[in-house]
């Protein structure tokens, strides 16, 4: 089972959101297929994705298990058609992902507001707890219970008659903040990590809610 | 090294017009929020307004509420303030600040500031 | 919007003095509080994050205090390179607002 005409991956991109964690490659495969292996810097390869022909691989059952470790991938071009052989010696080519560390890395998802309540002149905004597939004793995880304190939220509201974007900020996943009575709001949250000093410590924003729609109550 | 430069002072005549930049520097201004500050000669901080580069979100301090427009080109690393229908009482050092976004840090890096001079 | 009193507007000290900066908040700001020192000609420096933790390389003789809705900054003796304008800023609510300053002179 030579590996003449097999080409080595390239381009190996980790794409992660809320620690769904997917490893993606090039080039598409012409008469070659693919193996995947995940490993943290101290242990064992493990092998995912045996001998497929797609340039993705979801390595999030192997990223969960501790997503504050740094975990290293490597992908292997194997011939089509290829049977793993015990008579073979040669090593297939292979390429090496960059380094992973979940914790400091995964993308955070879109927010979503969950509610609003008006009482008087102040409203309680709850931003939902998104699930994520980490999990402890058998249970999974919220965002808020991996991340605690280190995720924060920051909330924009506005008047529905004006553009100025005020800002409130929570380590929970709840606000009240003071407003105009007989005004309507806006809201919109995005998901922060303050720590992080890399390109994704923010989400994107949340879709934006206004008060007088269906997710909002008011009481005098 | 994270870093703050403002440019594009100087002396314009009162109803006139004036835009600011504020180049970054060891940090993307898409992941953290820009606010000018302004200091008239001899007086106190006065805050002007803030920008999220990376949704264009902002807000304005009531005194410079539609005649400043601030912006942000996240190519270009660099957050602005338009000035428009300047009146003397906007003469001061204009500082642009990063916002750290946190619940207990705020402005933790500033610019030199630039200076700004209406006048006829 | 919040104001936030500061006083005193300015002070005389001597080098080794214990000098308090106060500032009072109109509404609960929680611990949203930060300090900043300005030297003439300069840009603010940030000194106090938090209302009370001191920010990364300000020398330890700074520190500062919550006291429900009154802020205190205190150097516990003062050096010839702070003699300078500290302001207070809350950052709790939009629009974030500053003491008027209080400014540190040689007696």
């Known amino acids: 089972s030579g590996t003449t005409n097999t080409v080595a991956a390239y381009n190996l991109t980790w794409k992660s959101t809320n620690f769904k964690t997917i490893l993606e490659w090039e080039p598409k495969p012409i008469n070659q297929v693919y193996t995947v292996q995940i490993s943290t810097k101290s242990g064992d390869w493990k092998s995912k994705c045996f001998y497929t022909a797609d340039t993705e691989c979801d390595l999030t059952d192997e990223i969960v298990k501790d997503v504050k470790q740094t975990y290293l991938a490597r992908v292997f071009s194997y011939p089509a058609g290829h049977v793993e052989s015990t008579g073979s010696t040669e090593e297939p080519p292979y390429e090496n992902s960059p380094e992973f560390t979940p914790y400091l890395e995964t993308n955070l998802g879109q927010p979503t507001i969950q509610s609003f309540e008006q009482v008087g002149t102040k409203v309680n905004v709850t931003v939902q707890d998104e699930w994520t597939l980490v999990r402890r004793n058998d249970t999974f995880l919220s965002l808020r219970d991996v991340f605690g304190k280190d995720l924060i939220y920051t909330l924009y509201y506005w008047k529905s008659s004006s553009s100025g974007k005020k800002t409130a900020k929570t380590n929970t996943n709840e606000f009240l903040i003071d407003v105009d009575k007989g005004e309507n709001y806006c809201f919109s949250v995005q998901a922060v990590i303050p720590s992080r000093r890399t390109a994704n410590r923010k989400s994107t924003d949340s879709p934006v809610e206004c008060m007088g729609h269906e997710k909002g109550e008011s009481r005098e | 090294e994270v870093q703050l430069v403002e440019s594009g002072g100087g002396l314009v005549q009162p109803g006139g017009s004036l835009r600011l930049s504020c180049a970054a520097s060891g940090f993307t201004i898409s992941q953290y929020w820009i606010h000018w500050v302004r200091q008239a000669p001899g007086k106190g901080l006065e805050w002007v307004g803030y920008?999220?580069?990376?949704?264009?979100?902002?807000y304005y301090a009531d005194s410079v509420k539609g005649r400043f427009t601030i912006s942000a080109d996240t190519s270009k690393n660099t957050a602005y303030l338009q000035m428009n229908s300047l009146r003397a009482e906007d003469t001061a050092v204009y500082y642009c600040?990063?916002?750290?976004?946190?619940?207990?840090?705020?402005?933790?890096?500033w610019g030199q500031g630039t200076l700004v001079t209406v006048s006829s | 919007d919040i104001q936030m009193t500061q006083s005193p507007s300015s002070l005389s000290a001597s080098v080794g003095d214990r000098v308090t900066i106060t500032c009072r908040a109109s509404?609960?700001?929680?611990?949203?509080v930060a300090w900043y020192q300005q030297k003439p000609g300069k840009a603010p420096k940030l000194l106090i994050y938090s209302a009370s933790f001191l920010y990364s390389g300000v020398p330890s003789r700074f520190s500062g205090s919550r006291s429900g809705t009154d802020f205190t900054l205190t150097i516990s003796s003062l050096q010839p390179e702070d003699f300078a304008t500290y302001y207070c800023q809350q950052h709790y609510t939009t629009p974030p607002t500053f003491g008027q300053g209080t400014k540190v002179e040689i007696k």
């Open positions: 600040a990063r916002d750290y976004g946190s619940l207990r840090v705020s402005l933790d890096y």
């Open positions: 509404q609960d700001v929680n611990t949203a």
């Open positions: 920008i999220d580069p990376y949704n264009g979100y902002t």
